[in-house]
């Protein structure tokens, strides 16, 4: 194509551009350390930093870890991309009761409508099953005020979702998608220092580097990538996502390429001292099932929530953590709410896995 020749020649004398024969045009040459976001960049803004696998480039041009969907109740909805985080959602048959950035902090099984009720809307990854009376005007038989409450006007009662047993971070028992080999390896390799948090095996299906666009010698088909478990912060630096490996924490949102993982206290615990993207100290929630009162809320969105009477009004409650230390005053944003799972969960001062027996009492699982 002789007509392309003059255009090609104009690139030769310009060190900031090169000629791409495939697209037959002049392309902007990205500076060292930056890589094109498209085949033929036209301007400096078409060049980006290269993050490590499992990191994405956030709005502030920082490599930030993509969230992980390795928890057993999560599945990947969208993959980790160079400029957006992986997105996780609750696996089929479950819905998200506590949302998190690009993920779900807590999934519950979809409710089964109780006797006298039928499904109005089937459960999704975001919402629980919505039930309605089988015959209009007939109210459902409420076995106890804990399982059923008078609906607010315009809301429809739901059956209680079945909570997932709270998993502790035990390498040998944590369900690992993609095989158990690594979990067993991790269990044998990880040595815990005294009083340090336990560690968790990583799914063997994700050995460390997610595939990236090939980067031929001398070309710039790379994007800024941080190492796994790092995200690109606002300053364009790869920064470690917080880890939720402490026994009293659960992952609220996964590590994304441009945002940190966030952690929250596990069910049955409340945050006494907050920390960036996490909680520095979780304390056991007082357990007074007989004293709880129901708090009305939009039943179509969430499960029944129980509100504990103010601390100090419960004769059989001990809000003091296991170590005997009095809890710090809770942050103003932390409401004293116990969900239906928390009311069944006792804090156990070990790293042994916890299961709930049919009586609702915790059972230590030896593995």
């Amino acid at each position: 194509f002789p007509q392309d020749r003059p255009f090609e020649d104009t690139c030769h004398g310009n060190p900031s551009h090169y000629y791409d024969k495939a697209v037959r045009r002049c392309c902007y040459r990205c500076p060292m350390g930056l890589f094109p976001t498209q085949q033929c960049p036209q301007r400096p803004t078409d060049c980006r930093k290269q993050c490590e696998p499992d990191y994405y480039l956030d709005e502030a041009d920082r490599c930030t870890a993509c969230v992980t969907c390795s928890r057993d109740d999560l599945v990947e909805k969208t993959p980790c991309a160079w400029n957006s985080s992986r997105v996780c959602e609750c696996r089929p048959g479950m819905f998200c009761s506590t949302s998190a950035v690009n993920s779900c902090a807590r999934c519950f099984f979809h409710s089964v409508c109780p006797a006298g009720m039928i499904v109005k809307f089937p459960g999704t990854a975001q919402k629980n099953t919505v039930c309605e009376p089988a015959s209009p005007g007939v109210s459902p038989a409420c076995a106890s005020p804990e399982n059923c409450k008078e609906p607010s006007s315009g809301t429809i009662p739901q059956a209680k979702p079945t909570p997932v047993s709270p998993a502790t971070s035990s390498a040998s028992t944590m369900p690992v998608r993609g095989g158990t080999r690594l979990a067993q390896e991790a269990a044998s390799k990880l040595t815990r220092a005294p009083d340090s948090p336990s560690s968790v095996g990583r799914p063997s299906s994700d050995p460390g580097l997610s595939p990236t666009q090939p980067c031929p010698e001398g070309s710039g088909d790379c994007r800024k990538q941080c190492e796994p478990d790092y995200y690109l912060d606002e300053a364009g630096r790869c920064t470690a996502c917080v880890s939720c490996s402490r026994d009293d924490l659960v992952e609220k949102t996964p590590c994304a390429w441009n945002s940190s993982r966030t952690c929250e206290c596990r069910p049955g615990m409340i945050c006494a001292t907050s920390a960036t993207n996490s909680c520095a100290r979780c304390v056991p929630y007082p357990i007074c099932a007989a004293e709880t009162v129901t708090k009305p809320q939009d039943m179509a969105e969430k499960d029944t929530t129980f509100e504990a009477p103010p601390l100090g009004t419960q004769p059989d409650c001990n809000p003091t953590p296991e170590n005997g230390e009095a809890p710090a005053s809770t942050s103003p944003t932390q409401s004293l709410l116990v969900d239906s799972q928390a009311s069944k969960t006792l804090p156990i001062p070990t790293s042994a896995p916890v299961a709930l027996s049919s009586t609702g009492k915790p059972v230590l699982d030896a593995g």
């Epitope: 890589f35 290269q50 490590e52 696998p53 499992d54 490599c63 390795s70 971070s169 690594l182 390896e185 991790a186 390799k189 990880l190 220092a193 009083d195 340090s196 948090p197 560690s199 968790v200 095996g201 990583r202 050995p207 460390g208 580097l209 595939p211 990236t212 666009q213 090939p214 980067c215 031929p216 010698e217 790379c222 994007r223 990538q225 941080c226 190492e227 796994p228 478990d229 790092y230 912060d233 630096r237 790869c238 920064t239 470690a240 996502c241 917080v242 880890s243 490996s245 960036t276």
Partner: antibody, heavy 123, light 106 residues
Framework: QVQLVQSGSELKKPGASVKVSCKAS????????IHWVRQPPGKGLEWIGY????????DYNQNFQGRVTITADKSTSTAYMELSSLRSEDTAVYYC????????????????WGQGTTVTVSS | IELTQSPSFLSASVGDRVTVTCKAS??????VAWFQQKPGKAPKVLIY???YRESGVPDRFTGSGSGTDFTLTISSLQPEDFAEYFC?????????FGGGTKVEIK
Amino acid sequence: QVQLVQSGSELKKPGASVKVSCKASGYTFTTYTIHWVRQPPGKGLEWIGYINPSSGCSDYNQNFQGRVTITADKSTSTAYMELSSLRSEDTAVYYCARRADYGNYEYTWFAYWGQGTTVTVSS
Amino acid sequence: IELTQSPSFLSASVGDRVTVTCKASQNVGTNVAWFQQKPGKAPKVLIYSASYRESGVPDRFTGSGSGTDFTLTISSLQPEDFAEYFCQQYHTYPLTFGGGTKVEIK
């Protein structure tokens, strides 16, 4: 087991370039990034940069930007670190390193190190 | 992120309890590792994530701290522990190391 074997000592003149190799074995080379760290005599450690052998993409400490090039040859499972425009303060032991391969989180602390390559820059 | 290690040098006897500190110029969470290095050898990881002991590391080595202040403690110094110790932050790139603490025989 994981092993990182580096090339031998180098004596270079100021202004010259040096290319140090790091041959990996005992694991799938393209699965983990290879990092380079240096240690001047009697001093601390300084991170230089890393390469993703799978994609060929690299990232460098800005202190070395423009002078360092990290590459990888998948066929031989070898990473290379080339430092140009050498000066006397580049005299150091250069290490290649790899992060650990277990745990739920893949943070970059180094569990595996090469034996080190001494680079001396002297006129 | 700068890491300031102290002391830079200490003399101790076998059986002593030794404490090395590492202060970060900004919050690094628990993203700190501790290394031991003997002359002419590559560093060897002792502690990662501030308090996790690497497999095979004796339990006399303990790591603690979070945020900006970290400590490596050797509860009862053994002859093989005389070496140089470095902290590393891996919270933010570029990765940085402390200046080192040389533990020598008194």
